[in-house]
Amino acid sequence: REEAKPYPLFPGPFPGSLQTDHTPLLSLPHASGYQPALMFSPTQPGRPHTGNVAIPQVTSVESKPLPPLAFKHTVGHIILSEHKGVKFNCSISVPNIYQDTTISWWKDGKELLGAHHAITQFYPDDEVTAIIASFSITSVQRSDNGSYICKMKINNEEIVSDPIYIEVQGLPHFTKQPESMNVTRNTAFNLTCQAVGPPEPVNIFWVQNSSRVNEQPEKSPSVLTVPGLTEMAVFSCEAHNDKGLTVSKGVQINIKAIPSPPTEVSIRNSTAHSILISWVPGFDGYSPFRNCSIQVKEADPLSNGSVMIFNTSALPHLYQIKQLQALANYSIGVSCMNEIGWSAVSPWILASTTEGAPSVAPLNVTVFLNESSDNVDIRWMKPPTKQQDGELVGYRISHVWQSAGISKELLEEVGQNGSRARISVQVHNATCTVRIAAVTRGGVGPFSDPVKIFIPAHGWVDYAPSSTPAPGNA
């Protein structure tokens, strides 16, 4: 960045202004030491100075006061296109009695430090040294726009130059572009587009599906009100200024629709009375899912065909269907909704519940003593089919014998055929308490209420049976 480069100069459109997009005229070498006083911009002697002026307190041997120090006037406004190079300077003549003078560059009130192209050149003479501070930018960007000044410190006094305004002109630059939206069919919505120069003004044209919407341009910023759409459309805006045209990104405006049905349903787990399902939602129709509905019907052709509906939140795409019959086949469909409406139901899938333990005990348990054979006969009724929750494989009989100081519990397993059993008398002059539970492969059901019978001492006769009443008979 130390090589000398020519920078174009062109008289600007107004006094004190330069437009630098044309013929190169002058360049300053990037070297210190005595050089011919080539000026980037003409000084204007004799013109009153409006910047800060320092009146040094130091006097010469003859005690003559020194003239006030001030930066010479330079170009006030430079206009150039983006990516062009620019070089500007400020100059000052300083009496040689001052040592170690430094010039700093400032932009919009902040000192420019670090890797900027700032070069200070000294041109010493007998009494004064001309100092020229140059600032160059090889490829200007919009961020280089602003007010540049030089500052010089002498004896704790600060001397400030007039500002040099750099105006970088280019194609319009978007500060707000239209955003993609999901809209309700035939409902009005707004799109906003804003672009800036310089140069201003910036005019906006709107484009829908490659065709211009407005015949006449609108000044930036522009709001386009679309009265409503029936199908997806792509919008963009064109920003025009004297430098040319910039086109915004194209944004898709989608029309909200009912969602698609789920693309997958999985049966995660089955128990006797529940089925855990998960699903993968289909396309959401450009509107978030709100909730889902699980429809369940018995797959048995003889069932009444009624559909159970379970509503749940859209997330987490998981639902446990409860209160189902054991060992039953079901058809399951899933549908989800967004603000527009419900999706179609997914294809119906099949799922089965497993066997469970019976949910009720055997009914009408009756116990009586067969004294001749020294046995206790037990009779009962099967639980209702719907509450067997599986295929009965048998029964479990608990009989407890209690007499003075003795208590003895025994368990018997009996096959599923029939509904009677016979157990041997274990203790005489004792009470026998009998309970019965139905058994499936899914487990052992609840035991019936206890039925008690007294077993007398030998020779006693009491054939009266004991029983538990069937439901509704109590």
Partner: antibody, heavy 128, light 111 residues
Framework: EQQLVESGGGLIQPGGSLRLSCAVS????????MSWVRQAPGKGLEWIGI???????YSASWAKGRFTISKDSSKNTMYLQMNSLRAEDTAVYFC??????????????????????WGQGTLVTVSS | DAQMTQSPSTLSASVGDRVTITCQSS????????LSWYQQKPGKPPKLLIY???DLASGVPSRFSGSGSGTEFTLTISSLQPDDFATYYC???????????FGGGTKVEIK
């Protein structure tokens, strides 16, 4: 536009391996199960296997062991790795989107409802 | 594995004819109706015509219809059009099995 594009086919020697790709655009592999189907020259369609949206795979019994389906959801691409290739594997290989799929996780199987979008296919020729 | 048998394997017909293709499965299709029909033209991939045994896929002309349940299914073209000369495949899945079985195909050619 929803589209499937297969690639990776070509001439391969018997015993060799090949990996086919199916690039998906217009929808997400995270939301759809995908399948591979092949068709030998002048013959009918033959199902190879499926990968669910969650990544579970199920294959035809004849394809187990030699053919493996996988996917990279970040690239929206499904793959078919074919090993120990034989002359009878010469076919056009199609990838297809599964319109709906039911999975039975506890029993490790799943059922395809329909294949509603197909790629153009890529030809694999196994010959010495 | 379950087998899907299509008949006839070739069918010669004229434009305007009513055409029927049958598909028989060696065991019941999942849910009795998860059967699809596909149309394939030479050098092209198959295209879904019908699913759930009788539902028309999007964009399929109404001259195509499907029927059947369990193990026996039928595809009917009510009035054959020049664009319908192609090969048709049935396919379906089964409970307890991941296999998706295709029928052998029926080629409908110009008489």
């Amino acid at each position: 536009e929803q589209q499937l594009v297969e690639s990776g086919g070509g001439l391969i020697q018997p015993g060799g391996s090949l990996r086919l790709s199916c690039a998906v655009s217009g929808f997400s592999l995270s939301s759809n199960a995908m399948s591979w189907v092949r068709q030998a020259p002048g013959k009918g369609l033959e199902w190879i296997g499926i990968i669910s949206s969650s990544g579970s795979t199920y294959s035809a019994s004849w394809a187990k062991g030699r053919f493996t389906i996988s996917k990279d959801s970040s690239k929206n691409t499904m793959y078919l790795q074919m090993n120990s290739l034989r002359a009878e594997d010469t076919a056009v290989y199609f990838c297809a989107r599964v319109g709906f799929f039911v999975g039975y996780g506890a029993y490790d199987y799943g059922i395809i409802h329909r294949l509603d979008l197909w790629g153009q296919g890529t030809l694999v020729t196994v010959s010495s | 594995d379950a087998q899907m048998t299509q008949s006839p394997s070739t069918l010669s017909a004229s434009v305007g004819d009513r055409v029927t293709i049958t598909c028989q499965s060696s065991k019941s299709i999942y849910n009795n109706n998860w059967l699809s029909w596909y149309q394939q033209k030479p050098g092209k991939p198959p295209k879904l015509l019908i699913y759930d045994a009788s539902d028309l896929a999007s964009g399929v002309p109404s001259r195509f219809s499907g029927s059947g349940s369990g193990t026996e299914f039928t595809l009917t073209i009510s009035s054959l059009q020049p664009d319908d000369f192609a090969t048709y495949y049935c396919a379906g899945g089964y409970s307890g099995d991941s296999d998706y079985a295709f029928g052998g195909g029926t080629k409908v050619e110009i008489k």
